[in-house]
């Protein structure tokens, strides 16, 4: 994402929303969409949603993936539909983890 100042009337994108923050909605609207994966108590936790504030997305999307968390960001309507964040493996696997989608 380019390091530009937010527009006065920023473009909003429809994004897939999956996870606890979505309530009972399966979509949200924001300036960026994301797909994330984190390891929580040995579980792979997948979430999708919106960065609703410009600065929040700017910071998070620039954070490089770590063994415990990865976030992929995009701009475009429903652009996170077919994105699944991946943890960096570097040839290593993480034993004792399970896949878990927060719905």
């Amino acid at each position: 994402m380019e390091d530009e100042k937010p527009k006065v009337n920023p473009k909003l994108y429809m994004c897939v929303c999956e996870g606890l923050s979505c309530g009972n909605e399966d979509h949200c609207e924001g300036q960026q969409c994301f797909s994330s994966l984190s390891i929580n108590d040995g579980f792979h936790v997948y979430q999708k949603g919106c960065f609703q504030v410009y600065e929040q997305g700017k910071m998070t999307c620039k954070t490089p993936p770590s063994p415990g968390q990865a976030v992929e960001c995009c701009q475009g309507d429903w652009c996170n539909r077919n994105i699944t964040a991946q943890l960096p493996t570097k040839g290593k696997s993480f034993p004792g983890t399970q896949n878990f989608h927060l719905e």
């Epitope: 429809m14 399966d26 949200c28 609207e29």
Partner: antibody, heavy 119, light 112 residues
């Protein structure tokens, strides 16, 4: 161009159910949320609920939860609303509406279905 | 539910004149994403409603610049300048910040 073509007017008996359709054209059906709105005669508008055609996910106004069921058929780009246990209070015009992107609200409306409940 | 109070109920205007419609919400319409989802619609006689203004002040495509929207928080206004015959009908505000979505009760714009 974007069009939402709704089924024709209906006269139904109290206690019956009705299923109305809304055929979308001129855009990618699964990319836009479809909402349904009720307009009673000479009155304002009431939001019934929405369906996400891509996922099938729905959200209902509590008032209509036991009355309306929203579905879609992706293959024909058609949204449906079934209304059950009809009473005279359900006599109204029902609109299907496309929820636009970029926060535009309801950008396209169907022509409406007039439902009359009478014995 | 968010209650949308729209005034006046009826608004007699002269052609070429100005009109102002108010919409007040029972709670703030600022969404967690910072946007305010307050929209304005016109329903001409015998037609479906049509979008005029979205997110408080943005004119929808094809809407003439004699329509303008303003406001913030809980207090919003639709202004019409140089009223034309095709502007007559029922005007509604809609909030889509909170579920359930709720409409104002409508304002009928008619010739004085």
């Amino acid at each position: 161009q974007v069009k939402l073509l709704q089924s024709g007017a209906a006269l139904v008996k109290p206690g019956d159910s009705i299923r109305m359709s809304c055929k979308a054209s001129g855009y990618t059906f699964t990319d836009y949320i479809i909402h349904w709105v009720k307009q009673s005669h000479g009155k304002s508008l009431e939001w019934i609920g929405y369906i996400n055609p891509y996922s099938g996910g729905t959200n209902y106004n509590e008032k209509f939860k036991s009355k309306a069921t929203l579905t879609v058929d992706k293959s024909s780009s058609t949204a449906y609303m079934e209304f059950c246990r009809l009473t005279s209070e359900d006599s109204a015009i029902y609109y299907c509406v496309r929820r636009g992107h970029d926060g535009t609200g309801f950008d396209y409306w169907g022509q409406g279905v007039m439902v009359t409940v009478s014995s | 539910d968010v209650v949308m109070t729209q005034t006046p109920v009826s608004l007699p205007v002269s052609l070429g004149g100005q009109a102002s419609i108010s919409c007040r919400s029972s709670q703030s319409l600022v969404h967690s994403n910072g946007e305010t989802y307050l929209h304005w619609y016109l329903q001409k006689p015998g037609q479906s409603p049509q979008l005029l203004i979205y997110r408080v002040s943005n004119r929808f495509s094809g809407v003439p610049d004699r329509f303008s929207g303003s406001g913030s928080g809980t207090d919003f206004t639709l202004k019409l300048s140089r009223v034309e015959p095709e502007d007559l009908g029922d005007y509604y505000c809609l909030q889509s910040t909170h579920l359930p979505l709720t409409f104002g009760s409508g304002t009928k714009l008619e010739i004085k």
